[in-house]
Interface confidence: low
Amino acid sequence: FNISGCSTKKLLWTYSTRSEEEFVLFCDLPEPQKSHFCHRNRLSPKQVPEHLPFMGSNDLSDVQWYQQPSNGDPLEDIRKSYPHIIQDKCTLHFLTPGVNNSGSYICRPKMIKSPYDVACCVKMILEVKPQTNASCEYSASHKQDLLLGSTGSISCPSLSCQSDAQSPAVTWYKNGKLLSVERSNRIVVDEVYDYHQGTYVCDYTQSDTVSSWTVRAVVQVRTIVGDTKLKPDILDPVEDTLEVELGKPLTISCKARFGFERVFNPVIKWYIKDSDLEWEVSVPEAKSIKSTLKDEIIERNIILEKVTQRDLRRKFVCFVQNSIGNTTQSVQLKEKR
């Protein structure tokens, strides 16, 4: 299709070499009542806020994204050619930073319902640059933590070196939805709830004598609880003896609950005690069976191909540990009568 009629938007992504940050492009199709590009009758003005990345209509819930090769080759379908770029409805997610992401990206509705819609498209010219020393060296992280129940703030990485007074007007999005009341370089959160977790996008406009462009940054915000003050507790096994049948295979499961730690390094292992000897057993990898904001339950099994008389004399010990301390639970096997 002819892209000469597409509205054009220029964006700048200055990525930090320090973090594996993400980036997004919204399919900002022009507002119907302000533009001749899109079919006028699709949405009433009331349905469309000033700037809406996800248009609320079913017609626009799915769009087609293309990249325009710099050598003038035909447009390429993003989904086929770029595995590090993921399309989610009206948003294009760039999973890895790099100057090779620079280029022109075009989006348009998949459903073409009228002749007017053919030209309903947006061309986004994306420039990607690594952050230089001249730019702010200690900008806010692209991963930010908010402590549940406390006050906090989310800083726009590309503006965090500027004071609030210097800062230009910022447009914020959370999970693709416009946060219309937020205009400063920092979102202040009076009390943090789990719904504050998500992907935040901050945009502001920069210009020189020739043109203007949007500077965009993406912040992944996670809500966390304070580090646990408790050592892990073993949920299973509860009993210290277990009835078994000789000659039969046996699996003993150790399940332990670990409280949240910002640097999470759980240890869960089995070892065997036999009179004065003890040794760690090679067992299948531990797996997380339940994860919440406050804690995580991890399971690790010990598998005996068949229970022998010798096993009845041994103690099977599950050992779990976090940065606070460790807990053990031993199991003695007893022959079923």
Epitope: E20, H142, K143, G152, S155
Partner: antibody, heavy 124, light 107 residues
Framework: QVQLQQSGPGLVKPSETLSLTCTVS????????WSWIRQPPGKGLEWIGY???????NYNPSLKSRVTISVDTSKNQFSLKLSSVTAADTAVYYC??????????????????WGQGTTVTVSS | AIQLTQSPSSLSASVGDRVTITCRAS??????LAWYQQKPGKAPKLLIY???SLESGVPSRFSGSGSGTDFTLTISSLQPEDFATYYC?????????FGQGTRLEIK
């Protein structure tokens, strides 16, 4: 850009409490963890503990019984108190920012901004 | 606590030399290791994080490698400003610990 300015006395008497403050300028104290580290003369670095802007702390077990780290978000500063000091606590004390790194699908933390250091001598 | 042992403790080298410093952890720490440079009377400066990622603004002659228990910091061609003490640091589990340091001196 973020800078850390340390303040506090350079001389403390044995058995007294060492108190240092670190003021954050050029950025907010919110959303970050803030650490204290010390370095005895001619020796290596020892991590004392950290505080999150909300007040959550974690201390080195070797010093835990004597250490208190607190934060005052309204003043954009955090502080270290070390009680019952002895000559072994003589060191250069540093404050630092811990920044979260999104590395290999995990969160790691490194100290990317440091204060200028305060030499504290414990002597009567 | 996880112990980090650096070797050598001190090292003499000339401008232009290739230098390697090693750091061994007493238990596996994945890649949660950082390297810092410290000059006399100054605070440490972050060089490498996540074992091999170069901090913004640090010259590319510095590189890090390793995972698990064995890590190395390499300076491909020593410059006069590189003479300093280097520390490794683990952030895999508490308490956070540093190596004892490697002092790099001019030969």
């Amino acid at each position: 850009q973020v800078q850390l300015q340390q303040s506090g006395p350079g001389l403390v008497k044995p058995s007294e409490t060492l108190s240092l403050t670190c003021t954050v300028s050029g950025g907010s104290i919110n959303n970050y963890y803030w650490s204290w580290i010390r370095q005895p003369p001619g020796k290596g670095l020892e991590w004392i503990g950290y505080i999150f802007y909300s007040g959550t702390t974690n201390y080195n077990p070797s010093l835990k019984s004597r250490v208190t780290i607190s934060v005052d978000t309204s003043k954009n500063q955090f502080s270290l108190k070390l009680s019952s000091v002895t000559a072994a606590d003589t060191a250069v004390y540093y404050c630092a920012r811990d920044v979260g790194i999104a590395a290999r699908n995990s969160y790691y933390y490194v100290m990317d901004v440091w204060g200028q250091g305060t030499t504290v001598t414990v002597s009567s | 606590a996880i112990q980090l042992t650096q070797s050598p403790s001190s090292l003499s080298a000339s401008v232009g030399d290739r230098v390697t410093i090693t750091c061994r952890a007493s238990q596996g720490i994945s890649s949660a290791l950082a390297w810092y440079q410290q000059k006399p009377g100054k605070a440490p400066k972050l060089l490498i994080y996540d074992a091999s990622s170069l901090e913004s603004g640090v010259p590319s002659r510095f590189s890090g490698s390793g995972s698990g228990t064995d890590f190395t910091l390499t300076i491909s061609s020593l410059q006069p400003e590189d003479f300093a003490t280097y520390y490794c640091q683990q952030f895999n589990s508490y308490p956070i610990t540093f190596g004892q340091g490697t002092r790099l001196e001019i030969k």
